[in-house]
């Protein structure tokens, strides 16, 4: 593949990454799949600066990010280490709440209306943000 040097149409460039902001809602797994089909991943927040950038673009709307604990440990979808990485949970979160009555706890993380993070039922249809790094090789074959 060739190295991506600029962001696709309708994606926003920031700090050598490209971001795409949905305007509809999907369950976390469907949002994750959507990003993967775009050769991207759900957004991985690695700094306060990136948090502010994403927050500015999504506004006060529940929005999925690429963080989940569906198999036990909290994991970022791109392999970024959760334990040593940036975190911005709301107070009292994550709480793996079982009181929603939908079965199971809360295994997927999203931005809340104030930008801080909450864990919620992965089936909820929230907006989402895809991210891809400009410096990574794209999956498209090189032009001959």
């Amino acid at each position: 593949g060739s190295e991506r040097t600029c962001c696709p149409v309708n994606w926003v460039e920031h700090e050598r990454s490209c971001y795409w902001f949905s305007r509809s809602g999907k369950a976390w797994a469907d949002a994750d799949n959507y990003c993967r089909l775009e050769d991207a991943h759900l957004v991985v927040v690695t700094s306060w600066e990136e948090q502010k950038f994403v927050q500015h673009h999504i506004g006060p709307v529940n929005t999925w990010m690429g963080l989940h604990d569906q198999n036990g440990p909290w994991k970022w979808v791109d392999g970024t280490d959760y334990e040593t990485g940036f975190k911005n949970w709301r107070p009292e979160q994550p709480d793996d709440w079982y009181g929603h009555g939908l079965g199971g706890g809360e295994d997927c993380a999203h931005f809340t209306d104030d930008g801080r993070w909450n864990d919620d039922v992965c089936q909820r249809p929230y907006r989402w943000v895809c991210e891809t790094e400009l410096d990574k090789a794209s999956q498209e074959p090189p032009l001959l």
Epitope: N71, P91, E92, D95, D96
Partner: antibody, heavy 115, light 107 residues
Framework: EVHLVESGGGLVKPGGSLRLSCAAS????????MNWVRQAPGKGLEWVSS????????YYADSVKGRFTISRDNAKNSLYLQMNSLRAEDTAVYYC????????WGQGTLVTVSS | DIQMTQSPSSLSASVGDRVTITCRTS??????LVWFQQKPGKAPKRLIY???SLQSGVPSKFSGSGSGTDFTLTISSLQPEDFATYYC?????????FGPGTKMDFK
Amino acid sequence: EVHLVESGGGLVKPGGSLRLSCAASGFTFSSYSMNWVRQAPGKGLEWVSSISGSSSFIYYADSVKGRFTISRDNAKNSLYLQMNSLRAEDTAVYYCARVAALDYWGQGTLVTVSS
Amino acid sequence: DIQMTQSPSSLSASVGDRVTITCRTSQGINNYLVWFQQKPGKAPKRLIYAASSLQSGVPSKFSGSGSGTDFTLTISSLQPEDFATYYCQQYYSYPFTFGPGTKMDFK
């Protein structure tokens, strides 16, 4: 690496009290719910209690409700189980385990209730 | 409370056998089920989570399937180290409940 170590077990008379501790390391303790599970000698596993990462939500098995209290100290990466009004049927190995799907367990601590 | 049943309660098998253990729940739990292996004097070890996902580090001879109320754990080719007791557990709702266990020993 995730590591859980229980302590505080021992021999206690019926009606007595005991406090178990679980020291956690290798992960961001406050991000995870924690559980106590017990196993009576020669018997199966029984879930005892759970506590959410910030202690907002606490759950107990009916068999221990009103007698046992689960708590945690996130600053110390520690989980506790205060056991009061102990009965012979509380005799078991007590394990602490992480998250609802119990992905990591400690080695257990034996509690014996006998006169 | 969700009741759990496991069958068989005990099983005699030989090295190389393909073995299947069944777990049934009294109500639907989607895929909120885990399987554990426990050896005498040791803590349980998680083999399968979310009914069919293999725990990291667990050999692929272990597999899980099912959803709703009926679940199975399969060991494709039994080895000496697999002789142990196996438990299922639901984490769909509190109180969490375990199956009574399946003890596997040598035929």
